[in-house]
């Protein structure tokens, strides 16, 4: 039975040209995290494998940086970066947990962070 929950940074906003940290945290389970995949809609951004470390998709290497931790830093944001991002935790023995973050990239300087929320 999957008992864990994914806590994410929730709905967030950031300024065009700036950077943002996408973070997820898996709690309430003793399952071992073997890999975390980061996706933007259906596109792979990065993989963090427990044994092999990071693989950043070549399509995003110039503006995606690994970390902190299992998170991902998006740089040089454009309005086209607005949308859904998913952290996909592969665990043993539980299986797969998925967290969702919605990022809005704003033209103005009034980018405020949304509250944290949980996905069971």
């Amino acid at each position: 039975m999957m008992t864990g929950t994914i806590e994410t940074t929730g709905n967030i906003s950031a300024e065009k040209g700036g950077s943002i940290i996408l973070q997820c945290h898996l709690s309430s389970t003793t399952a071992q995290v073997t890999q975390v995949n980061w996706e933007q809609q259906d596109q792979l951004l990065a993989i963090c494998n427990a044994d092999l470390g990071w693989h950043i998709s070549p399509s995003f290497k110039d503006r995606v940086a690994p970390g902190p931790g299992l998170g991902l830093t998006l740089q040089s944001l454009t309005v086209n970066d607005t949308g859904e991002y998913f952290c996909i935790y592969h665990t043993y023995p539980d299986g797969t947990y998925t967290g969702r973050i919605f990022l809005e990239v704003l033209e103005s300087s009034v980018a405020e962070h949304g509250a944290r929320f949980q996905i069971p």
Partner: antibody, heavy 118, light 107 residues
Framework: QIQLQQSGAELVRPGTSVKMSCKAV????????INWVKQRPGHGFEWIGD????????NYNEKFKGKATLTADTSSSTAYMQLSSLTSEDSAIYYC???????????WGQGTSVTVSS | DIVMTQSQKFMSTSVGDRVSITCKAS??????VVWYQQKPGQSPKALIF???NRHTGVPDRFTGSGSGTDFTLTISNVQSEDLADYFC?????????FGGGTKLEIK
């Protein structure tokens, strides 16, 4: 010992298709990307695309979209590449090579020779 | 696409010599460059990854250097078994692209 074992040479007719295989031995198949590369004498190496069996992510070189189809079977640790509508330009040696992050294409298969001839 | 240019198609050297093979990228690829050796009738073997890191089991006479657009593979104390083609690969961006290769001939 890490090995990528590729299927044998193929002699095929123009206009037909061919499907070749690449069996991974000695490492966790789902952890690494499988790249496919074409080598033709006088033309050097061309990257066709890659597939990540651990998530079925696939990337193609635009030049080979519609020509190559990449698949993987995790139960047998085997990757496949199908080439369609074959012409003489497709006569080449095709290699599979594993990769991940900094270790881009670190181990290669022995190659599959494809000859397209009527 | 990023073009990887190896301007020397052939290089001739003698056993014990030092030889440098160069590769130039058409745009900045940071250090995402791999060097390979391919002997006749064999598949490529990785020598250097991330421009300057030797792959497992590669003799220390092979060294790689460079970043950005200019990369060099140096073979010091060349041995007869080093007779092969050498080529570079960039994996900074899709599509991955290869240099045309440099054939090392032993005098």
């Amino acid at each position: 010992q890490i090995q990528l074992q590729q299927s044998g040479a193929e002699l095929v007719r123009p206009g037909t298709s061919v499907k070749m295989s690449c069996k991974a031995v000695g490492y966790t198949f789902t952890n690494y990307w499988i790249n496919w590369v074409k080598q033709r004498p006088g033309h050097g190496f061309e990257w066709i695309g890659d597939i990540y069996p651990g998530g079925y992510y696939i990337n193609y070189n635009e030049k080979f979209k519609g020509k190559a189809t990449l698949t993987a079977d995790t139960s047998s640790s085997t990757a496949y590449m199908q080439l369609s509508s074959l012409t003489s330009e497709d006569s080449a040696i095709y290699y599979c090579a594993r990769g991940y992050g900094s270790y881009a294409m670190d181990y290669w298969g022995q190659g599959t020779s494809v000859t397209v001839s009527s | 696409d990023i073009v990887m240019t190896q301007s020397q198609k052939f290089m001739s050297t003698s056993v014990g010599d030092r030889v440098s093979i160069t590769c130039k990228a058409s745009q900045n690829v940071r250090t995402d460059v791999v060097w390979y050796q391919q002997k006749p009738g064999q598949s490529p073997k990785a020598l250097i990854f991330l421009a300057s890191n030797r792959h497992t089991g590669v003799p220390d006479r092979f060294t790689g250097s460079g970043s950005g657009t200019d990369f060099t593979l140096t073979i010091s104390n060349v041995q007869s078994e080093d007779l092969a083609d050498y080529f570079c690969l960039q994996h900074w961006n899709y599509p991955y692209t290869f240099g045309g290769g440099t054939k090392l001939e032993i005098k």
